[in-house]
């Protein structure tokens, strides 16, 4: 069966309660023409910042064409949760759904979207909208990847040696230096899925007086600099 490509649109806005909200729906440029019978899975990987709100969308099919709308939610270490709406009886049903932050945006007969309020690390998982029509099913799937901004610190720990740490980020941050030095990088994995990256660098060349640690992460990039002193300097700390 024909299926759309994964050209995507990410919309972000501010809600009244000051939480950023993101909605990932298919870009209107993406749809192919001759849809037939059952659509193959259309899946999207979607990174979402922790503590924001997220809205997940179904395919654009009018309610008048539908029999059932189902959201299937598979989170790590939990049984599959399903939220279903049956148009004929105007009833909704939930199975194995315990997270009260995952809800329909509004009444499913008005809006089939799913919302996650205040995204947490535990919301990492797979979300799928299944729209049942008389002629087959339309699917839209999301691999939701929750992003956690690491805390970045930079300090000098001994003569001409600096340490840059990106603490508890998800996924792991990448650390680079300007200028390049003699560096060693270690990663520490935490049980909640976050990673601490520690990069220790030494500069033998004495004409290097200031070094910059650049931390790259999906939530944003951060640069900190420090002057190399003969004795350890002040600690610098920042959030991305």
């Amino acid at each position: 069966a024909a299926q759309p490509n994964n050209s995507l649109m990410l919309q972000t806005s501010k809600e009244n309660h000051a939480l950023a909200s993101s909605s990932l729906c298919m870009d209107e440029k993406q749809i192919t023409q001759n849809y037939s019978k059952v659509l193959a899975e259309v899946n999207t990987s979607w990174p979402v910042k922790m503590a924001t709100n997220a809205v997940l969308c179904c395919p654009p099919i009018a309610l008048r064409n539908l029999i059932i709308i189902t959201w299937e939610i598979i989170l790590r270490g939990q049984p599959s949760c399903t939220k279903a709406y049956k148009k004929e009886t105007n009833e909704t049903k939930e199975t194995n759904c315990t997270d009260e932050r995952i809800t329909w945006v509004s009444r499913p007969d008005q809006n089939s979207d799913l919302q996650i309020r205040t995204v947490a690390i535990t919301h990492d998982g797979y979300y799928r909208c299944i729209m049942v029509t008389p002629d087959g099913n339309f699917h839209r799937g999301y691999h939701l990847q929750v992003l956690v901004t690491p805390e970045v610190t930079l300090f000098q720990n001994r003569n001409r040696t600096a340490v840059c740490k990106a603490v508890a980020g998800k996924p792991a941050a990448h650390i680079s230096w300007i200028p390049e030095g003699d560096c060693a990088t270690k990663q520490e994995y935490w049980s909640n899925g976050t990673v601490t990256v520690k990069s220790t660098c030494h500069w033998e060349v004495h004409n290097v007086s200031t070094v910059t640690c650049h931390v790259s992460h999906l939530t944003g990039n951060k640069s900190l600099y420090i002057e190399l002193l003969p004795v350890p300097g002040a600690k610098k700390s920042a959030k991305l």
């Epitope: 209107e28 440029k29 969308c57």
Partner: antibody
Framework: QVQLVQSGAEVKKPGASVKVSCKAS????????MHWVRQAPGQGLEWIGY????????NYNEKFKGRATLTSDKSTSTAYMELSSLRSEDTAVYYC????????????WGQGTLVTVSS | DIVLTQSPASLAVSPGQRATITCRAS??????????MHWYQQKPGQPPKLLIY???NLESGVPARFSGSGSGTDFTLTINPVEANDTANYYC????????FGQGTKVEIK
């Protein structure tokens, strides 16, 4: 291929009723919503309503409620639009159109049926 | 009901030029990142023909000279470059709730 073939032209007197048919072929008739639209001479398109042959759900433009009746016959894959209490301003070409699922667009139309209301 | 207002009512364009038709909805026809706005072309004695669906998607078999844009309440159909056989009436239509059409734009080729 998908085809919607409508019944022939009709001439009716004011106060009478007319029933226009739309025979579908090339797809499963009960799987798709059918809309009805009319176009008076030299005028634009006016939505009358739709019927879902799967469950016989209907929905009408407020203007036509009580006067238009949409029905379907699954055995012959035919949709019908009946308009009662005809008046001269109902003179128009009446079209059926199939709604496709994705995007709710109308990809297939009947050829149109001219209904003339004249005393 | 959502009211669709098309402008201009008529348009005369020379071949090779650009024709632009706008359609304004009385309230948003967009939801979940999709705009339920479509554009149709109708030539005399024929039923309408779908050109653009969901605001910007080109229907199969329609020349790439036709394009659509917009979201929320404001939408545009563009024909560039215009050809002689583009003489027709053009209608916008929304399908989000109960359905309505714009009043139409007559495009004539000079």
């Amino acid at each position: 291929q998908v085809q919607l073939v409508q019944s022939g032209a009709e001439v009716k007197k004011p106060g009478a009723s007319v029933k226009v048919s739309c025979k579908a072929s090339g797809y499963t008739f009960t799987s798709y919503v059918m809309h009805w639209v009319r176009q008076a001479p030299g005028q634009g398109l006016e939505w009358i309503g739709y019927i879902n042959p799967y469950n016989d759900d209907t929905n009408y433009n407020e203007k036509f409620k009580g006067r238009a009746t949409l029905t379907s016959d699954k055995s012959t894959s035919t949709a019908y639009m009946e308009l009662s209490s005809l008046r001269s301003e109902d003179t128009a070409v009446y079209y059926c159109a199939r709604e496709d699922y994705y995007g709710s667009r109308w990809g297939y139309w009947g050829q149109g049926t001219l209904v003339t209301v004249s005393s | 009901d959502i009211v669709l207002t098309q402008s201009p009512a008529s348009l005369a364009v020379s071949p090779g030029q650009r024709a632009t038709i706008t359609c304004r909805a009385s309230k948003s026809v967009s939801t979940s990142g999709y705009s339920y706005m479509h554009w149709y072309q109708q030539k005399p004695g024929q039923p309408p023909k779908l050109l653009i669906y969901l605001a910007s998607n080109l229907e199969s078999g329609v020349p790439a000279r036709f394009s659509g844009s917009g979201s929320g309440t404001d939408f545009t159909l563009t024909i560039n470059p215009v050809e002689a056989n583009d003489t027709a009436n053009y209608y916008c239509q929304h399908s989000r709730e109960l359905l309505t059409f714009g009043q139409g734009t007559k495009v004539e080729i000079k």
